[in-house]
């Protein structure tokens, strides 16, 4: 017998899809080897149609796809718009030719079958309602008018012109005509139910002069669509319920033993395991909504059901829709721990990563509140100025190419720990989460920075110096500007007669900024930190303030400008080459963006890496010929 | 919640056929698949066949001990599932139990299935 296993015998009708799932045995060969599906001919040879190795014969070409689920032992074949041509036996396997481990499985395909002429069919969604059309001669006018269900012995009352109404109809059935048409009466049964399915009989008058009409009752139950995604990628459910439920409370549930668990719903309710991970979204006044899931777990998969009721919970007569979603090992987003720890007063460098075939994408950083529906508010982008509750303190630096960018948060406060998401106006299913867990601190930073209270005077020399331990001996340290644009590293070269230089003191560990002479540009926020090649890692912050000699302490105010400033970091020089780029207003970056809001994510995060630079440059640009300082130890 | 009767099991002479039903009542439109195991004494729950449905496409799963000998079918006005069983062998003997599943990842492992009915007997003799 093969250890492959499906199912034996598939049957469909023409136009419909099916979705074969053929199960392997665990094994680490079997999981990466060739899959195929082929269809065997009279000779005993199996034509291959689809192939793991992205074969797909004519035939199949834009209908059909097979997908490796290597964390189940399974795979997937998904085969569309089926006609009667695709009746057969075909054999599902593993293998590098046809001949390897299979299984056999016939397909059957019929013609959609026909009713008899005098029975009307209406077919409609669980939840929704229908309107039964019931024609009758003139003379029946006014005779008693009826819809009966039939069971196997007789035809069960459901409602009559006399106002009787079978119990289990209360509430969901009226008998109406409109206006002055004497020949139809209607019958409207609402929030159907399995239950109501069936035969049918409306009838006007009694004996052999009755008008009576068949009516075959379907009430469907949705099909599921089955959606694909990767790990660590993110799922929006798109959740189209009809106006009819408009002003209902909206939820999204996961199928479970017994029940359907609710997730979310526009009630508040939230279940904790997708707590920072989640976004309930109302689309518009006709039943619309939207559920978004950023950082797909492997227990994420299952069968989801979304639906619309008062209570906000699953009720039976309510319309609904339904997916399975599958969730896909072989991620090609990168793994990332998904929890970022920072400490009071320190910093935190986060790598977002993104599609890197999208580089020239905008990218964005939002924080996750869970008030209401759940929203992300933008704090930082490419092209979006730092939100200004975060100044001086949070940039953004976008590392062209590699498939990260880097944000980095320093002056943490326990305010600060929460979720964020990274996310871009590209490739959504790179929209990530990470948690900020923020401790208090217990020593002191790694980074200092002397004097503290920085004040400048205009005119003059001013030396700030940035302390740090041995352990960043051989880590990149520099000194950059910060503006609400992001942070710009200061440029390694003279600009004329304005002297300003940073030095390296080994024995004391330290890295020195001079400005010389101090202008009122140079006020503002300063950025100390270190970083190995494009991993950045902690930072500090200082605002130097600029007053004129005779001055009392200067405002705090910051300015966009960049300081003029030299940076000589050990026996090397930082060459500071910066693209320029304009700064435009944030452009709508998602279905859900509501101004600075975007309402879209992923899970992902680095643990524990302070932060650095951030700067995303978008502001003036320099580049620099390196020069070789002297350095005073 | 989803109900599940069987009915049809009975003593038969080897070569026989029987006809096994399991009537599914509740909510029953969450269901996506219905099946068949049996348990003989001092053996394990083992699995013969099931069925899951996806609108109008049926997928059929047979164990080798009774492809060819055992169909299973669905009424779906009646939330019915069949197991008409023909040339039935000694080796058949067994309490037969309905299984119904909201979401079904292997249809041969029976914690994939979320409901149970009591069980049916079927003997054969030879």
């Known amino acids: 017998k093969s250890p492959i296993f499906g199912p034996q015998e598939v049957s469909s009708i023409e136009g419909d899809s099916v979705s074969i799932t053929c199960y392997y045995p665990d094994t680490s060969v079997n999981r990466h080897t060739r899959k195929y599906w082929c269809r065997q001919g009279a000779s005993g040879m199996c034509t291959t149609l689809i192939s793991s190795n992205g074969y797909l014969s004519k035939e199949y070409s834009g209908r059909a796809n097979l997908i490796n689920f290597p964390e189940n032992n399974t795979f997937v074949i998904n085969i569309e718009q089926l006609t009667q041509d695709d009746t057969g036996s075909y054999k599902c396997g593993l293998g590098t030719s046809n001949r390897g481990l299979s299984f056999d499985v016939s397909l059957e395909v019929s013609q959609v079958p026909e009713l008899p002429s005098d029975t009307h069919v209406y077919t409609k969604d669980i939840g929704r309602n229908v309107t039964i059309e019931c024609p009758f001669k003139r003379e029946n006018a006014p005779s008693k008018k009826s819809l009966c269900k039939k069971t196997n012995q007789s035809c069960e009352l459901v409602i009559d012109s006399t106002e009787k109404v079978n119990p289990s109809y209360i509430g969901r059935a009226k008998l109406f005509m409109k206006g002055t048409d004497l020949t139809v009466f209607y019958v409207n049964i609402s929030h159907l139910t399995h239950n109501d399915a069936g035969l049918y009989i409306c009838q006007a008058g009694e004996g052999p002069s009755a008008d009576k009409k068949n009516v075959d009752l379907q009430v469907l139950a949705p099909e599921p669509e089955l959606l694909y995604k990767d790990l660590r990628s993110s799922v929006t459910f798109e959740c189209d319920l009809g106006r009819e439920v408009a002003n209902e409370a909206k939820y999204l549930c996961r199928m479970n033993k017994e029940t359907c668990d609710v997730i979310i719903n526009t009630l508040g309710k939230r279940d904790p395991d997708f707590e920072g991970r989640i976004l309930i979204t109302p689309k518009d006044d006709n039943g619309r909504f939207s559920v978004l899931i950023t950082g797909l777990r492997k227990e994420d998969a299952g069968h989801y059901q979304c639906g619309a009721h008062s209570s906000g919970l699953p009720q039976e007569g309510w319309p609904i829709q339904t997916w399975q979603l599958f969730v896909n090992e072989e991620s090609t987003i990168p793994n990332r721990r998904s929890v970022v720890k920072g400490v009071t007063g320190g910093s935190v460098a986060i790598a977002c990563p993104y599609n890197p075939k999208e580089s020239s994408s905008l990218k964005y950083w939002c924080r996750w509140e869970g008030d209401g529906n759940g929203h992300c508010p933008v704090l930082v982008g490419t092209q979006a100025q730092v939100q200004e509750e975060y100044e001086g303190r949070l940039a953004l630096f976008d590392q062209p190419g590699n498939g990260t960018y880097t944000v980095i948060l320093n002056q943490l406060t326990t305010e600060d720990a929460g979720f964020y998401w990274c996310l871009t106006n590209g490739d959504s299913r790179w929209r990530t989460t990470i948690e900020l867990q923020v401790a208090e601190a217990t020593r002191e930073p790694n980074l200092e920075v002397t004097p503290q209270n920085a004040t400048a005077v205009l005119g003059e020399t001013f030396t700030v110096s940035c302390h740090y331990p041995c352990k960043f001996y051989s880590q990149e340290k520099y000194w950059c500007k910060w503006s609400n644009k992001g942070c710009h590293i200061l440029p390694s070269h003279d600009e004329g007669a304005r002297q300003s230089s940073v030095s390296c003191d080994q024995s004391s560990q330290l890295v020195s900024m001079t400005l010389n002479p101090v202008s009122k540009e140079d006020e503002g926020w300063y950025w100390c930190g270190v970083k190995q090649g494009q991993t950045y890692g902690e930072t500090t912050a200082i605002y130097i303030a600029v007053e004129e000699r005779t001055r009392g302490s200067s405002h705090v105010n910051p300015t966009d400008a960049n300081a003029r400033a030299k940076v000589a970091l050990e026996e090397e020089v930082v060459d500071s080459s910066i693209s320029e780029k304009e700064n435009k207003a944030i452009p709508n970056p998602g279905p859900f963006a509501n101004e600075r809001e975007i309402q879209n994510v992923g899970d992902q995060a680095q643990e524990n890496r302070a932060s650095g630079d951030a700067g995303s440059a978008d502001g003036q640009s320099r580049s620099s010929s390196s020069k070789h300082h002297h350095h005073h130890h | 919640q989803v109900q599940l009767v069987e009915s049809g099991g009975g003593l038969v002479q080897a070569g026989d056929s029987l006809r096994l039903s399991c009537a599914a009542s509740?909510?029953?439109?969450?269901?996506?698949?219905m099946g068949w195991f049996r348990q003989a004494p001092g053996k394990e729950r083992e699995f013969v066949t099931t069925?899951?449905?996806?609108?109008?496409?049926?997928?059929?799963y047979y164990a080798d001990s009774v492809k060819g000998r055992f169909t299973i079918s669905r009424d779906n006005a009646k939330n019915t599932v069949y197991l008409q069983m023909n040339s039935l062998k000694p080796d058949d003997t067994a309490v037969y139990y309905c299984?119904?599943?909201?979401?079904?990842?292997?249809?041969?492992?029976?914690?994939?299935?979320?409901?149970w009915g009591q069980g049916t007997q079927v003997t054969v003799s030879s």
């Open positions: 299984a119904a599943s909201t979401v079904l990842r292997d249809p041969r492992v029976p914690t994939e299935y979320d409901y």
């Open positions: 509740g909510r029953t439109f969450t269901t996506y698949g």
């Open positions: 069925i899951t449905w996806s609108g109008s496409t049926n997928y059929k």
